[in-house]
Interface confidence: low
Amino acid sequence: LQDPCSNCPAGTFCDNNRNQICSPCPPNSFSSAGGQRTCDICRQCKGVFRTRKECSSTSNAECDCTPGFHCLGAGCSMCEQDCKQGQELTKKGCKDCCFGTFNDQKRGRCRPWTNCSLDGKSVLVNGTKERDVVCGPSPADLSPGASSVTPPAPAREPGHSPQ
């Protein structure tokens, strides 16, 4: 025998208290598939969460984060505090990137400067807390007169010219 509830479309639920009649989902609830025996409660984007998409009878609300925070996790399950460029979020709050690392975004971790010498290249522009180094052409690529760029002396640490 076919399950009578299978005829209930998305946006309704199979109401067992009413002889398995398909009843519309109550306010603030939804069913995204047919044949459901209950409607799911809509997600509420409260506090540091902000509504990106309102809940409908067939789809859940979608949240993002208020300014100063960014989403983490599937479906923006958490909001994490933004930091400034040149910083990363630690358990003690926003901290400046350590020397030799950078972060050009308001989220995420500080990443090491590119080691230009690994590719046989020179450092064209030194790195900062906010920006990676810019690698120049390798000295071998610079035949006399081929470029007006004079590469700086090779750095002892990636991205940092000798003092």
Epitope: Q44, K46, T66, P67, S77, M78, Q81, K91
Partner: antibody
Framework: QVQLQESGPGLVKPSETLSITCTVS????????VHWVRQPPGKGLEGLGV???????NYNSALMSRLTISKDNSKSQVSLKMSSLTAADTAMYYC???????????WGQGTTVTVSS | DIQMTQSPSSLSASLGDRVTISCSAS??????LNWYQQKPDGTVKLLIY???TLHSGVPSRFSGSGSGTDFTLTISSLQPEDVATYYC?????????FGGGTKLEIK
């Protein structure tokens, strides 16, 4: 170093309104939320409500009609007001900083409130 | 509201013992659970967040585990300074709610 310090009246009469202030130092109220928690004598912790960096609030549903949480960013102060007090509101009241990743990482020392005539 | 139930409500253990405290949620809360320690003088400190992440400065003898509705706080080797009441707290849904607490004493 981040510190939170609660200050309250100590003794309040039944039916009156309680007003407690949480002063935050070493942290900006525009970057973190503040949650109020209370603990009746000999009992567990009960969350009262939170005020977010942008100023929006969420309250314990059972106490919502009696609670107001507000803040003054320039003074780094958060205030809790609770109306229609009864003896059941006698408790230690704490404020705690809420990080964007949803935990209370710094707590105040608490302020004792006794509701009695 | 989501109800959080802790067990036992109190326990007594010897120094060096392995201690476990349980916390149960009335509905699934994924891993959205924190643990706090309240010392006898009333001071409250965060121990563990997001079920198992140790807060900075918390000794490594503390650990947390679980998912869904059942969670555990473990102290691998009980120390005198661990005498306190321990609370779990869910942040899956507002209002955030605490367990009833587990009072830990030394035998």
């Amino acid at each position: 170093q981040v510190q939170l310090q609660e200050s309250g009246p100590g003794l309040v009469k039944p039916s009156e309104t309680l007003s407690i202030t949480c002063t935050v130092s070493g942290s900006s109220l525009t970057s973190y939320g503040v949650h109020w928690v209370r603990q009746p004598p000999g009992k567990g912790l009960e969350g009262l409500g939170v005020i977010w960096p942008g100023g929006s609030t969420n309250y314990n549903s059972a106490l919502m009609s009696r609670l107001t949480i507000s803040k003054d960013n320039s003074k780094s102060q958060v205030s809790l007001k609770m109306s229609s007090l009864t003896a059941a509101d006698t408790a230690m009241y704490y404020c705690a900083r809420v990080t964007g990743t949803w935990y209370f990482d710094v707590w105040g020392q608490g302020t004792t409130v006794t509701v009695s005539s | 509201d989501i109800q959080m139930t802790q067990s036992p409500s109190s326990l007594s253990a010897s120094l060096g013992d392995r201690v476990t405290i349980s916390c149960s949620a009335s509905q699934g809360i994924s891993n959205y659970l924190n643990w706090y320690q309240q010392k006898p003088d009333g001071t409250v400190k965060l121990l563990i967040y997001y079920t198992s992440t140790l807060h900075s400065g918390v000794p490594s003898r503390f650990s947390g585990s679980g998912s869904g509705t059942d969670f555990t706080l473990t102290i691998s080797s009980l120390q005198p300074e661990d005498v306190a009441t321990y609370y779990c707290q869910q942040y899956s849904k507002l209002p955030w709610t605490f367990g009833g607490g587990t009072k830990l004493e030394i035998k």
